[in-house]
């Protein structure tokens, strides 16, 4: 056993190359210099080491860097990254987006592992916020990233980062998440002109309040029915027939096909049948003529 700990004569590795795949685990431990390994980490990925051999290489790096690996090593970990534990990763200080991309590439196409989740957490905390470039990178690898975050986590996304969000990144977000993202998008896109603004804000409108929908109705935006159906019911209900007509423009005809579905159904119930008739779509279920409409919520607020 004692002899095995010493490197056999002529076996000392002058560099990291393919010949090392024939080394037994104890030979790798004894014959590969940890500092050499650290400087030539980029070569490891090209060599078909077994999992057991990778364990040895990781052990050597752990001994060399007990406080955590430097970024120069982390960037070239490649498949060795899969051997890291969240505890290992918590010791790292990753600041380069290139390093993050290199490690995400290793896990590409697979569900996010605890290691990747820890890496992202460390990276974002190190940057202080989820900035535009980071968000761009994360959504490229993980299209559902934003919609997997809690509203609390989303609240820390700065408005400037919203420019990195593509419509498909929001496809599976729920209303509570959009409630958080919408005000940020509104702020981010506030200096754009009417039609350009609408194109950008459209995917976020599931979080829009009534007053913003009223404002949009004055801008000839021609909202499509798919977007309208994703609006908050409580935001749609106070809109008048005229406002909905202006908001939807030529798409207003689509209301007929959706008259039994929320939010259209609930909105119809709040409108006077006379007003609905002016659309000429045959929408039924409005408040009959001559009925008095009491706004109970207003009454409660006053009492």
């Amino acid at each position: 056993e004692v002899e095995k700990t010493a490197c056999p004569s002529g076996k000392k590795a002058p560099e990291i190359d393919e010949s090392l795949i024939f080394y037994k685990k104890w030979e790798l431990e004894a014959c590969v210099d940890a500092a050499l390994l650290a400087t030539q980490m980029d070569r490891v990925n090209a060599i078909p080491f077994t999992y057991e051999q990778l364990d040895v290489l990781k052990h050597k790096l752990d001994e060399l860097y007990p406080q955590g690996y430097p970024e120069s090593v982390i960037q070239h970990l490649g498949y060795l990254f899969l051997k890291m534990s969240p505890e290992d990763i918590r010791k790292w200080n990753v600041t380069s987006l290139e390093t993050l991309k290199a490690l995400l590439e290793v896990n590409k196409g697979h569900e996010m592992s605890p290691q990747v989740a820890t890496l992202i957490d460390r990276f974002v905390k190190g940057r202080g916020q989820l900035d535009k470039d980071t968000l761009d990178t994360l959504t490229a690898f993980y299209p559902g990233y934003l919609c997997s975050l809690s509203p609390e986590e989303l609240s820390s996304v700065p408005p400037s980062s919203i420019w990195a969000v593509r419509p498909q990144d929001l496809d599976t977000c729920d209303p509570r998440q959009l409630d958080v993202l919408y005000p940020k998008a509104r702020l981010a896109f506030q200096n754009m002109n009417g039609s350009e603004y609408f194109v950008k804000i459209q995917s976020f409108l599931g979080g829009a309040p009534t007053e913003d929908l009223k404002a949009l109705s004055q801008q000839n935006v021609s909202m499509d029915l798919a977007t309208f159906m994703k609006l908050r019911t409580d935001a749609v209900l106070p809109l008048t027939v005229a406002e909905v007509q202006k908001l939807l423009g030529p798409h207003v005809e689509g209301l007929k096909a959706e008259e039994r579905h929320r939010p259209v159904r609930d909105w119809i119930l709040r409108q006077r049948q006379d007003d609905l008739d002016t659309l000429g779509l045959g929408l039924q279920g409005g408040i009959p003529n001559g009925y008095l409409v009491l706004d109970l919520s207003m009454q409660e607020a006053l009492s």
């Epitope: 996010m112 592992s113 993980y142």
Partner: nanobody, 116 residues
Framework: EVQVVESGGGLVQPGGSLRLSCGVS????????MRWYRQTPGNQREWVAS????????GYADSVKGRFIISRDSAKNMMSLQMNSLKSEDTAVYYC?????????WGQGTQVTVSS
């Protein structure tokens, strides 16, 4: 392969309670948000409630707020929806939805019927 399975649906009288469960098997490893949606015939799916990956914070549709409670057991990859004070308009097929950073997974649904 990730599988999502709902259970617990059934027939209940107005004002009654029911508890739905959702089990997830497969390699859902980190950062997943779990949601309940429901769908009535001819209608689009409607969001009911969510429980988020970090800290277990929750969100509810206005129509169920104060009546339904969503909870999860991350260790067992389970989620449940406690439905109280049920109304006839809660009748629907209830679907469990698991959102990961990479994908969205749906169950086959469980029927809830509220009727006297």
């Amino acid at each position: 392969e990730v599988q999502v399975v709902e259970s617990g649906g059934g027939l209940v009288q107005p004002g009654g309670s029911l508890r739905l469960s959702c089990g997830v098997s497969g390699s859902i490893l980190a950062l997943n948000t779990m949601r309940w949606y429901r769908q009535t015939p001819g209608n689009q799916r409607e969001w009911v409630a969510s429980i988020y990956s970090s800290g277990g914070s929750t969100g509810y549709a206005d129509s169920v707020k104060g009546r339904f409670i969503i909870s999860r057991d991350s260790a067992k990859n389970m989620m449940s929806l406690q439905m109280n004070s049920l109304k006839s308009e809660d009748t629907a097929v209830y679907y469990c939805n698991v959102q990961t950073p990479l994908n969205v997974y749906w169950g086959q649904g469980t029927q809830v019927t509220v009727s006297s």
